[in-house]
C-alpha cells in the first residue's frame, strides 16, 4: 500500500521539475551537488545548477528531446564529471567518473566526507549580513544552502529547504527591526543548533540504512512510529514505515529530488488519513508543505488507546507461538515490536529494538527445543535487566549532571571517554563528549516517563557521530567493535568499556599546554573548548590520573586564564605563568 505508485515518465528530470517547481528544483540540485563536491567554490556550483535547470526546462517543453530520457544519476553525474579541477581537488574521487551508473553514484557516495577540511563558518556583522541579504536575496539564500550542504553531506535535503525558509524569514523580519542584532542573533543561534541536531539525526538514519541495511531501519521506524501513533493499526504503521524507508533511502542515496517529492506525498497521505493515524496531526496538517512535513516529523506521541490487553497471552503464554513465528516470521516479529512499542512510549527506541532482538533470539533457540513452550515461557523475565540498565544509567547520570552543571558534567564525560578510547583524536573526543554532556540539559528536566526515550535515543545520535568520524580514520579497535557489531547496542557497548589498559601514554609536549592572550577574546563556549582540549590531552598523558588530580589541575588552569586575562600585559603573563602552571601540573600528576 505504498503512496509512491507512479506511472513511468518519459523524462524523469521533467517529471521532478514539474512536481517540485523551479525554486525547489534548483535548491535541491544545489544541495545535491554541494554534498557530493564539498570543496568546489560556490560560483562553480551555481553555474552547474543553472545548466541543469535550463536542460530540465527543455525537457519540460518536450519530454522526447535529446537526453531527457536519461536517469537523474546519469544527468547529474555527467554534470559533476565536467568539473575541470576534479583530480586536483578531490584526488581519487575523480576515478568515479570512469565508472558507469549505478557504480558511479555509489562511488561518489563513498567519497562523501563527514569532516571536510573547510574553514569554520564565521558570522559577519549583522549590518554586513543585512546588506548582503538586501543586495541579492537569492544569492544570499543559495549561499546558505551551499555552506550547510557541503559541511553536512547527509543533511536531510527537504528539511534543509525548511531551514532556508526560516533563515530567509529571520532576515526579512530582523533587518527591518530597530535592534537588528537583538532580533537576528538569537534566531540564527537557534537555527544553527537545530541544524546541527537535524544533521546528526539524519546521519544516524543514513548510517542505519547503509551499514546495517533496510531491515534495521524498518525496525527502528516500526518502533518509533508505533510509539508516536499508538492508535494506528499495524497495517497503517507498516505502510508508513515502507514509505518512510523509501524517502530516507532516496535522500541517503543522493536522490534528493525523488526524496523531496516522495516526502511531500507522504505528508499529504498522512494528513488525508490522520483520523486513522493520530489525533495530534491537526495543527501540522494546516501548515504549508515544508512546515507540515517538519511538524509531522516532530509531532508528539498520541495517547495510548484504551483496552490494550496483556501481550503475554499472544507472545508468551500461547503454545502456538512457534507455529506463528515459523510460518510468518516478519509479520509476527513486526507485530511484537509494534504492540510493545505502542504500549511503551516511556522506553527508548533502541531499548525496544533490544527487547525485540532478545525475543527473536529466544524463539530461534526455543522453537528448536524439546519443549518450546517451557523454554520461552520466561522470555519476558529476560527483559527486566535490559530495561533496568538504561534506567539506572540515566538516573545516575542525571544526578551527576544536577550536581555538576553542564560544563563540569561534560568534563566528567571527557575524562571517562578519553580513558575508554584514548587513541581517538582530541578534537573528536571534545566534540563528542561535549555533545554527550548536552544530554543533561536536554533530557534530565523531563519526568521519568520521558527521560529514557529522550536520553538514550539522543545518545545513539551522538555516538553515531563518533562512529562516522572514526570510520574515516580508524585508530581504535574498541571503537570499531562498538560501532559495527550492533546498531542498537552501541551505547551499552561504549558504557561497558573500561579504561584501556593497553594504551601507552602520550609523550608530554609543553606546546600542547601553552596558551596565549587570544584566549581572552574568545566566547565562553570557545574558551570552554580550549580548556576541554587541554583536559583531554592531560588524560592522554596521564590516563591513570585520579578525578581529584585532574580537578586540581583544571582549577589551577581556570585561575591562570582568569588572572592573565585581567593582566595589563596579557601575553607576558601567559608566557611566564604558563610555564609555572605546566611545571606545577607535571608535579601534581607525577609526569
Amino acid at each position: 500500500r505504498g503512496v509512491f505508485r507512479r506511472d513511468a515518465h518519459k523524462s524523469e528530470v521533467a517529471h521532478r521539475f514539474k512536481d517540485l517547481g523551479e525554486e525547489n528544483f534548483k535548491a535541491l540540485v544545489l544541495i545535491a551537488f554541494a554534498q557530493y563536491l564539498q570543496q568546489c567554490p560556490f560560483e562553480d556550483h551555481v553555474k552547474l545548477v543553472n545548466e541543469v535547470t535550463e536542460f530540465a526546462k527543455t525537457c519540460v517543453a518536450d519530454e522526447s528531446a535529446e537526453n531527457c530520457d536519461k536517469s537523474l544519476h546519469t544527468l547529474f553525474g555527467d554534470k559533476l564529471c565536467t568539473v575541470a579541477t576534479l583530480r586536483e581537488t578531490y584526488g581519487e574521487m575523480a576515478d568515479c567518473c570512469a565508472k558507469q551508473e549505478p557504480e558511479r553514484n555509489e562511488c561518489f557516495l563513498q567519497h562523501k566526507d563527514d569532516n571536510p577540511n573547510l574553514p569554520r563558518l564565521v558570522r559577519p556583522e549583522v549590518d554586513v549580513m543585512c546588506t548582503a541579504f538586501h543586495d541579492n536575496e537569492e544569492t544570499f539564500l543559495k549561499k546558505y544552502l551551499y555552506e550547510i550542504a557541503r559541511r553536512h553531506p547527509y543533511f536531510y535535503a527537504p528539511e534543509l529547504l525548511f531551514f532556508a525558509k526560516r533563515y530567509k524569514a529571520a532576515f526579512t523580519e530582523c533587518c527591518q527591526a530597530a535592534d537588528k542584532a537583538a532580533c537576528l542573533l538569537p534566531k540564527l543561534d537557534e537555527l544553527r543548533d537545530e541544524g546541527k541536531a537535524s544533521s546528526a539525526k539524519q546521519r544516524l538514519k543514513c548510517a542505519s540504512l547503509q551499514k546495517f541495511g533496510e531491515r534495521a531501519f524498518k525496525a527502528w521506524a516500526v518502533a518509533r512510529l508505533s510509539q508516536r501513533f499508538p492508535k494506528a493499526e499495524f497495517a497503517e504503521v507498516s505502510k508508513l514505515v515502507t514509505d518512510l524507508t523509501k524517502v530516507h533511502t532516496e535522500c541517503c542515496h543522493g536522490d534528493l529530488l525523488e526524496c523531496a517529492d516522495d516526502r511531500a506525498d507522504l505528508a499529504k497521505y498522512i494528513c488525508e488519513n490522520q483520523d486513522s493515524i493520530s489525533s495530534k496531526l491537526k495543527e501540522c496538517c494546516e501548515k504549508p508543505l515544508l512546515e507540515k512535513s517538519h511538524c509531522i516529523a516532530e509531532v508528539e506521541n498520541d495517547e495510548m488507546p484504551a483496552d490494550l490487553p496483556s501481550l503475554a497471552a499472544d507472545f508468551v503464554e500461547s503454545k502456538d507461538v512457534c507455529k506463528n513465528y515459523a510460518e510468518a516470521k516478519d509479520v509476527f516479529l513486526g507485530m511484537f515490536l509494534y504492540e510493545y512499542a505502542r504500549r511503551h512510549p516511556d522506553y527508548s527506541v533502541v531499548l525496544l529494538l533490544r527487547l525485540a532482538k532478545t525475543y527473536e533470539t529466544t524463539l530461534e533457540k526455543c522453537c528448536a527445543a524439546a519443549d518450546p513452550h517451557e523454554c520461552y515461557a520466561k522470555v519476558f523475565d529476560e527483559f527486566k535487566p535490559l530495561v533496568e540498565e538504561p534506567q539506572n544509567l540515566i538516573k545516575q547520570n542525571c544526578e551527576l549532571f544536577e550536581q555538576l552543571g553542564e560544563y563540569k558534567f561534560q568534563n566528567a564525560l571527557l575524562v571517562r571517554y578519553t580513558k575508554k578510547v584514548p587513541q581517538v583524536s582530541t578534537p573528536t573526543l571534545v566534540e563528542v563528549s561535549r555533545n554527550l554532556g548536552k544530554v543533561g540539559s536536554k533530557c534530565c528536566k523531563h519526568p521519568e516517563a520521558k527521560r529514557m526515550p529522550c536520553a538514550e535515543d539522543y545518545l545513539s545520535v551522538v555516538l553515531n557521530q563518533l562512529c562516522v568520524l572514526h570510520e574515516k580514520t580508524p585508530v581504535s579497535d574498541r571503537v570499531t567493535k562498538c560501532c559495527t557489531e550492533s546498531l542498537v547496542n552501541r551505547r551499552p557497548c561504549f558504557s561497558a568499556l573500561e579504561v584501556d589498559e593497553t594504551y601507552v601514554p602520550k609523550e608530554f609536549n609543553a606546546e600542547t599546554f601553552t596558551f596565549h592572550a587570544d584566549i581572552c577574546t574568545l566566547s565562553e563556549k570557545e574558551r570552554q573548548i580550549k580548556k576541554q582540549t587541554a583536559l583531554v590531552e592531560l588524560v592522554k598523558h596521564k590516563p591513570k590520573a585520579t578525578k581529584e588530580q585532574l580537578k586540581a589541575v583544571m582549577d589551577d588552569f581556570a585561575a591562570f586564564v582568569e588572572k592573565c586575562c585581567k593582566a595589563d600585559d596579557k601575553e607576558t603573563c601567559f608566557a611566564e605563568e604558563g610555564k609555572k602552571l605546566v611545571a606545577a601540573s607535571q608535579a601534581a600528576l607525577g609526569l
Partner: antibody, heavy 120, light 108 residues
C-alpha cells in the same frame, strides 16, 4: 465508522455448502486475528476459528475439515466456507475482531450476525 | 483444549442487588479471561478482559477477579439494564479460545 457486517446467510439443505462474508470498514482486516463465532438458538457461544495476521488459520476441533476461513485483504473482507452442512449447524454466525494480529481474545468488536438455517 | 464451566446457569435477582457469577477453567489460563454481556438479538458486548481490566465505557459497578482456574464477575448494584446473559471466555493458552455456556440473569 469501525464496523463488521456479515452476509451470505440463509436456508440451505443438509449436505449443502454456504459461504459467509464479513465486510470490515474503518480498519484493515490484515492487522487483526479475525474470528468466526456461532450461536444456535437459545444456546451457548461457540468459537469456530480464526485467521491471524500471518494468514494462519486455526479451528475448533469440531470445525476442522468442514469449515474454512479465508480473507481478501484487497476487499477487506473475511470469509467462512461451510461444507457438508448439518441441521446442528443452524445458528447465527458472527464475525469478531481479536485484540491484535495474533490474539485469540478478547473480542471487543462484533458484527450483528447472519442467520444460517440447515433444513430440508 | 480447556473447558470453561459457568455457574449458575441462571440467576434471578432484584435491582440494587450484588450479583456474583463464577467461571472455572479445566486448566490454568493465567489471567486470560474475558466477560461478555449479551441481550437478545444483539452480539455479545465485552465488559472485562485479562480477568480484571474494565473495558472503557463499561460502568464501574462491573468488576472481575481471579486467576489460574477460578474467576468471578461481580455486579455491585444491579441496574435494570443489566438483566441479560453473561458469558466468560478463556483465551491465550493457544491459538484457540473457549466460551462458557452462559449465565442468564433475570428479574426476581
Amino acid at each position: 465508522e469501525v464496523q463488521l457486517v456479515e452476509s451470505g446467510g440463509g436456508r440451505v439443505q443438509p449436505g449443502g455448502s454456504l459461504r459467509l462474508s464479513c465486510a470490515a470498514s474503518g480498519f484493515s482486516l490484515s492487522s487483526y486475528a479475525m474470528n468466526w463465532v456461532r450461536q444456535a438458538p437459545g444456546k451457548c457461544l461457540e468459537w469456530i476459528g480464526h485467521i491471524n495476521a500471518g494468514d494462519i488459520a486455526y479451528y475448533a476441533t469440531w470445525a476442522k475439515g468442514r469449515f474454512t476461513i479465508s480473507r481478501d485483504n484487497s476487499k477487506n473482507t473475511l470469509y467462512l466456507q461451510m461444507n457438508s452442512l448439518r441441521a446442528e449447524d443452524t445458528a447465527t454466525y458472527f464475525c469478531a475482531r481479536g485484540a491484535g494480529g495474533f490474539s485469540t481474545g478478547p473480542f471487543k468488536l462484533w458484527g450483528q450476525g447472519t442467520q444460517v438455517t440447515v433444513s430440508s | 483444549a480447556f473447558e470453561l464451566t459457568q455457574s449458575p446457569s441462571s440467576l434471578s435477582a432484584s435491582v440494587g442487588d450484588r450479583v456474583t457469577i463464577t467461571c472455572r477453567a479445566s486448566e490454568s489460563i493465567n489471567s486470560r479471561l474475558a466477560w461478555y454481556q449479551q441481550k437478545p438479538g444483539q452480539p455479545p458486548k465485552l465488559l472485562i478482559y485479562d480477568a480484571s481490566d474494565l473495558t472503557s465505557g463499561v460502568p464501574s459497578r462491573f468488576s472481575g477477579s481471579g486467576s489460574g482456574t477460578d474467576f468471578t464477575l461481580t455486579i455491585s448494584s444491579l441496574q435494570p439494564e443489566d438483566f441479560a446473559t453473561y458469558y466468560c471466555q478463556g483465551y491465550g493458552g493457544s491459538s484457540t479460545t473457549t466460551f462458557g455456556c452462559g449465565t442468564k440473569l433475570t428479574v426476581l
